[in-house]
Structures are given as structure tokens and as C-alpha cells.
Amino acid sequence: IVLRPSRVHNSEENTMRALTLKDILNGTFSYKTFFPNWISGQEYLHQSADNNIVLYNIETGQSYTILSNRTMKSVNASNYGLSPDRQFVYLESDYSKLWRYSYTATYYIYDLSNGEFVRGNELPRPIQYLCWSPVGSKLAYVYQNNIYLKQRPGDPPFQITFNGRENKIFNGIPDWVYEEEMLATKYALWWSPNGKFLAYAEFNDTDIPVIAYSYYGDEQYPRTINIPYPKAGAKNPVVRIFIIDTTYPAYVGPQEVPVPAMIASSDYYFSWLTWVTDERVCLQWLKRVQNVSVLSICDFREDWQTWDCPKTQEHIEESRTGWAGGFFVSTPVFSYDAISYYKIFSDKDGYKHIHYIKDTVENAIQITSGKWEAINIFRVTQDSLFYSSNEFEEYPGRRNIYRISIGSYPPSKKCVTCHLRKERCQYYTASFSDYAKYYALVCYGPGIPISTLHDGRTDQEIKILEENKELENALKNIQLPKEEIKKLEVDEITLWYKMILPPQFDRSKKYPLLIQVYGGPCSQSVRSVFAVNWISYLASKEGMVIALVDGRGTAFQGDKLLYAVYRKLGVYEVEDQITAVRKFIEMGFIDEKRIAIWGWSYGGYVSSLALASGTGLFKCGIAVAPVSSWEYYASVYTERFMGLPTKDDNLEHYKNSTVMARAEYFRNVDYLLIHGTADDNVHFQNSAQIAKALVNAQVDFQAMWYSDQNHGLSGLSTNHLYTHMTHFLKQCFSLSD
């Protein structure tokens, strides 16, 4: 199936050019998306190209600037946030990245009523997190690991927590492992819907072992970065959840929310918090052995001034075939009765589907069903539920938006996006205004991305928000590779793959093959999305065939495929890449003497193991920032899929699945190993151990480190990295420079 319709007529072919590496490194062919910053049912804010903050009213068609670029520039603001009462705007500047989501910044409060910055009781700097209450203009912020509250921007702050300490106690923000592997946010505090209460997490990292690495910088002596980082089997953070009344916080103080007894009996995690009403909150907890999750609904008891979490409002989700949930345990979306909710979890056939829970999970009503998966619930209104799935035409790598009418019986289902721009758009996400009065659809491909605005009642398209016209024009004289998404059926396993083919691809010729792999649990690489990236260049200019394969362990095709890797990472993911390569060779257009594999992070692990599989299939390969032993990686992630590295649990497979154990097998391949020395995520230790094992085995290999670079290898390192990898592959494939 060719997903990118050709825009080329033969007469124009001589004016066409191939992609260059420079195109990729300069981001020449990057696309834009438009996500409205909704502030009501019919209004949204957007930062214009010239940096004004503009308010749009869909119903009147009017727009006006609420904050000029001059005001933004006066404090070098790169971000903003309007208070719900529309009286104030916070302006964010001095952005300083910490980990994946976290950063610190300086915040200024601008008073829209008088056009001046609020003076007196200014915010301290740098702040770790700041947010408005959902109603009015209260502010909660985290400074030096403690939480503060302001009733009004000009008021003095009330300090809610006092025990915050760098690398020890985190209040209102997650520690490293919770940020990266559990919450996937920079914050750990949540306002109740009307701003009466503020819930927050406290993470105690006092007993967690610390990863230490050198940051070389420019000084005479390197700095040492210390991060409490629990590796598999190590001591984990201790979490507690508190709720404080923000109206008169000095009186009652923070109230600790009780942990369900069945969770508290052993090591556990807090996984998410969802406010239902101002006086009802839902917390999700997870056992350290992550196959049991408990959803607990707690109510505020006015007479006791406390939070009560009755056992009758505890809902257990358990997996008998793998871990609980997909990548994370799904979060509930509550209905208007404020007690029943919709949630995605596995049905009896092992497919993730939407269920409606009114009293118990056992009595859940299944809302969607089929041999496909519901992926995200966007919004529940009184009469509709909007969700995304990969049902349409049985392509797991697509995403369409559906509406189920829950107000009528039987509920009817409508695909909102399936036929809108069928060739161009097969992978959508959506953003809804209050009460789903309007919504934006963002299409990511396979054609050029486009963002559109729609009426929430009729689904009618109102206007195009961004259609990437400049990109479309820029690509007119570019010879883009062809892309196809197909599947292989092997031993009752379906292996979906994406193949990227050179522009003048000829099935009768032989091409070098590069496998790009990620392959991590609950990931998906074969997606119907638009991209002009490094592998596009390799196909377009260097004439390579690139393939991506979703094997066992990958997502959205049912639990059988997903949980196949449970407790045995590094086995089936590698097998399935190898199986696919053999099938590609059988197709007749692959030069079997020129096959390579590369991957980053989990993909670096898989590519390393594939190279060391002893099959003789691969001539060369690259591992960027690979995991080399699961004992070196984070507890929350690793143990979810592998259990504990203890004798009575799964130590044997931890030991068997290392890259180092296969050092001898690298002798007959060309291996390029790459890692950033300041990788906070997959520590440089992983590559250091691979290198040591290869040296000890007297196996030759190539390596590149990037000083002071993290897991993303950003900035100038990116250019160096892709240039270096290109040279390596061209040499491997005997392609002239």
C-alpha cells in the first residue's frame, strides 16, 4: 500500500532532487501542528507567528490580542498562562531543562486590568512548577521542593510544605523515576475542579541509591551529578498523598490520603490522581510487582474534615498474563453522576477496550469490542463519548476518532475522521473545548499534517487551523521515498512492517537494507504518520531500503502480542526482527550481503542483541544509548516487564539477557556503539560495560561518546551523530561518499 500519493509527473522528474543530510539536520521539512489553548466552550488562545497572544471566539468570529509581543519580549517570555478569571497572565522565561518533562523557570505575573506587572510579593526564582487554580486566580507553585500557595498574585505566599530537600524530599514535583516512568509529568499536584482543595504527592528518596556521573563542563574539575535513581531491585521512593483546603489552609493542615490496605501491605507506587468533584477524588495505586492496580475513590467528610476512602469504592485491576495496563495503567474518565466512570482495560479476549464501571469492575459494561484496541478516551459529555482506536480497516498503526452516543440506547458509534481526508489523514489526535462544544483535529499523516477545527455537535469542519502549505510547496521538487505498510504472517504471529523505498525503486534490483528498531514493550513503530527524517534521506539519496517492524511486545494488537515478552525481555523482540529480515530477503530485492540494523535506547539494546545473534544476517549495526543489562535500568520500568532480579524471582533471565553475555558474537559484525556521557536515563555505564566486555573478548568495534550529552543527544551533537552514522553505514554498504 503506497501511503504517499505521488505528486510527480515524468516531465517534472529532471527538476526533482533527492533529500540531503543537510535538509534533515536543518529541519527544512519539519511540519507544524495547531493545538488550541482552550479557555471556554467557544474560545481559545493561540500564540501568533509574531508572538502576540490572541484570543479567538469561534462563535463571533472575533479575535483580539490579550498580550502583545512587546510585553512578552519585555521579560523574554517563552510561554504564558492565563488565569481562569482572565485577570492575570503568568509569563515564563529563563527556561532551564532538567529531565524529560521537568524544567525550572522565572515567572512574572501580568495584570491585564491595568496593563502592568504585579509588584510586591514577587515570585522567587527559579520555580520548579507553577499553575493557576481552575477557577479564579489562586496560584500554586513549587520552589526548592516545597509547595506554596497564593490566594491572589499580589498576596504573600503561604508555605504548605516545609520538608522539601534537594534529592531527598520532593513535594508537588516527582523525583526522577516517577517523572520518567510513572507520571510522565513535571508536576505532582492537582487542583480540585473549583480550586477548593489542592492534592499533592510527597516523594521521599532518602534511602534510594544514587547514580553519580561526571559533567565535564568548562571548569578545571568536572562536576558530579547525583540523582537518586532506583535501578531494578533497589530501594524505591516512598510516596504519600496529601490534600489541603486552600481557602483556609492554615487551620486544618494537609490531610494524608490513606493507601488501600491490599496495596500498603508491600512496596507500592502511586500512579495517578483524578479529581471527580471538589469533594471526591480518585487515586490509583500499583503494587511494586505491577500486575495489581487499585483505583480508590475518596470522599471529603465535612463533619470530620477528612478524606474517607471506603473499601466499597476500591476497584481492583489485575493481569494474569502480564503487567497491569499497557505502558501505564489507564486513567478513569468520570461521567456526570460523579461516581461511574469509563476506563480502558483488557477484555476477556485480551484486547484493550473501553468499559463502563458503575459499581464493581466485575460488573463492568463493555463499550467497545473487537480484534483491535481502544487507545484513548478524549472526552465524556452527557450524551457522547469521544475516543481513538485503530479499528478502521484493521491497520494497527492508524488512529481515528470515534463518537459513541451514550445518551441514547442502544449506543450508536460513528467514526468522525475515517473518511475526512482518507489518503492524507489516517493518524489523528484531538483537542476538545469545554463540554466538547468544539474540537480540533490534528492529523499527523501519512500525508502532510493538517489541523482543523470542528463543531462538537455536528462534527462539521469549521476551518483549517494549519495546513503546512509552505512545507507542501517546499516538497514539490523533492524526490521523497515511497512508503508502504504491510504485514507478514509468521507462525501465527502478525508482524506489521513499514518499508521505506528509494524514489526510483525497482523490484528487480538489489538494495541494501537498514532495519530501524525500537521494539520496547507497548511501543509502536509502524504508524501511518508523516516524517521527513534521517531514514527518508537514506532512502532518497543513498538508495537504501529501510524497514521498521513491530514484533512481539509491541502495542495495540492485543495482549497475546503485548505480553509475549513478559519476564523475558531481549528474546522475542530480537527473534521477530530476524524473522522479518529473512522474509524481506525472500522478497527478492534485498542485497543479503548488505543488511544493517540500528536503534536508540531500547532499540539500541535490540540492535545489539540482533547483531550478536550469530545468524550472520547483519553486516553491521549501530546502537545509540543502549540498555546493556536490565540490572542497570530503572526499577519502575524494568520490573514492570521483568519482575525482580532476585534468585527466587527472575535473576536468571536478568543475567541471560545482557549484551555483555554475547560479546564473542560481535566478532563477525561491524558494531558502532554510541552514548552520551551525561545520560540521566540510560546511564553511560551501559555502554561502558559493553565496551569492557568487547575489549575483554578482544573483539574490535567502533565507538563514539558525546561529552555532557543526555539521552537525547541534542544540539550540535545531533548533527555530528547523524553525519557519523551516515559515514558508518555508507562504508558498511560500500556506497561512495
Epitope: 503561604f158 508555605q159 504519600r240 483556609y248 492554615a250 493542615g253 477528612t306
Partner: antibody, heavy 117, light 108 residues
Framework: EVQLLESGGGLVQPGGSLRLSCAAS????????MSWVRQAPGKGLEWVSA????????YYADSVKGRFTISRDNSKNTLYLQMNSLRAEDTAVYYC??????????WGQGTLVTVSS | EIVLTQSPGTLSLSPGERATLSCRAS???????LAWYQQGPGQAPRLLIN???RRATGIPDRFSGSGSGTDFTLTISRLEPEDFAVYYC?????????FGQGTKVEIK
């Protein structure tokens, strides 16, 4: 009717220890933060320590930090203040009060602690 | 820490008169975090005005609290015989919570 009843005060030598108790009744003790406030003879009020409802977080005035420990037993509806390394300047009437940092809406009658050699 | 200064130190008034007691903070506090207490001789303090300028349960409406920022006032509209006592203001916005030194309202 809300009642707070302090006990455990008395005469103690400098460097000595005392444990004050406050028995609560008439309200759901386990739901509320509690504090200790003291008043030296003929002087004003001074906040000493506070503890949240679950007992999971405690707070102290600098003047007593490291020497005093606040705790509670919610099953017994009782608040405690363990006072070690007592000094002459700790001499005061010690009140237990319902509340965290402010709005102390119920107070006990107090118990006198005298530190003297 | 926040220092609260109460004035006057002593207020001599007759029953039926209006009493105005002042409390000044060394830093901005706001009424959400300021309370007033009454302490009779040999008695425990009693909450009069709760944080947020709200009268505490059972307190007669002749007592009222006002002010914002750093300046706060407790007003007793008509003094009754039982009102002659020491009055303390207290802030709860910052640790440690602190009390003013007190204003003694005595019978003239």
C-alpha cells in the same frame, strides 16, 4: 462538647525530660491537626509544635527543634509532647490546641512546666 | 519569622465604649491567615476571629476583624464587662506561627 485536657506537667531540673499528654474528646480527633502553644509566666503566647491529622508530618519552633518531639495516638485520641534537655526558658504553661498554624479554635486549660534546679 | 506588633499595649475604656485594637505585621500576611484571641486572667486563650476575618463559633457580633496586608484591626463595638481581657493577634501564613505581644483592655 469539645474538651482538651493536658497532663504531665511539673517541676523538672535543667537537662531533664517530661512527657506531656493531651486527651481529646467531643470531636473526631484523628481528622485534625493539633498544636502545642506555651506561655511563660506573665508573657505572651508562643507556638511550639504542630502535627497533622495522620501524624505523618511534624513542625517545630526553632527554639525547641531537636529537643522536643510531638506525636499522637489516634486510637487513644491523645496528643503528646516529649520534652528532652529542658532549659529554664522552657518554663511555661503548655496548652494543647486544635489547629495547624492558625485559627486554634479549641484550647486545653494548660499544664505548668517548671524547669528549675 | 514574622513579627506582629500590637498597639496600644494597654487600652483603658469603660463598658459600652468602642475598642479598636491594632496589629501590624513585619511582612504582608493578608486576612486569610490572621486570627484574634481573647485571654481572660488565669484562663486559656479563646478564638474570636478566625483566619479570613470570620467570627469563630459562638462569638457575639460586637467583635469584628478587618484589615489586609500588614495592618489589621480588631473592633469591639460596645464593651461588655466580660470583654476586659488580653487580646492577641496571630499569623499563620509562615512557619513559625507567631503571636503579637498582646493588648490589655482594662476597665477605666
Amino acid at each position: 462538647e469539645v474538651q482538651l485536657l493536658e497532663s504531665g506537667g511539673g517541676l523538672v531540673q535543667p537537662g531533664g525530660s517530661l512527657r506531656l499528654s493531651c486527651a481529646a474528646s467531643g470531636f473526631t480527633f484523628s481528622s485534625y491537626a493539633m498544636s502545642w502553644v506555651r506561655q511563660a509566666p506573665g508573657k505572651g503566647l508562643e507556638w511550639v509544635s504542630a502535627i497533622i491529622s495522620s501524624g505523618g508530618l511534624t513542625y517545630y519552633a526553632d527554639s525547641v527543634k531537636g529537643r522536643f518531639t510531638i506525636s499522637r495516638d489516634n486510637s487513644k485520641n491523645t496528643l503528646y509532647l516529649q520534652m528532652n534537655s529542658l532549659r529554664a526558658e522552657d518554663t511555661a504553661v503548655y496548652y494543647c490546641a486544635k489547629g495547624w498554624f492558625g485559627g486554634f479554635n479549641y484550647w486545653g486549660q494548660g499544664t505548668l512546666v517548671t524547669v528549675s534546679s | 519569622e514574622i513579627v506582629l506588633t500590637q498597639s496600644p499595649g494597654t487600652l483603658s475604656l469603660s463598658p459600652g465604649e468602642r475598642a479598636t485594637l491594632s496589629c501590624r505585621a513585619s511582612q504582608s500576611v493578608t486576612s486569610s491567615y490572621l486570627a484574634w484571641y481573647q485571654q481572660g486572667p488565669g484562663q486559656a486563650p479563646r478564638l474570636l476571629i478566625n483566619v479570613g476575618s470570620r467570627r469563630a463559633t459562638g462569638i457575639p457580633d460586637r467583635f469584628s476583624g478587618s484589615g489586609s496586608g500588614t495592618d489589621f484591626t480588631l473592633t469591639i463595638s460596645r464593651l461588655e464587662p466580660e470583654d476586659f481581657a488580653v487580646y492577641y493577634c496571630q499569623q499563620g501564613i509562615m512557619l513559625p506561627p507567631t503571636f503579637g505581644q498582646g493588648t490589655k483592655v482594662e476597665i477605666k
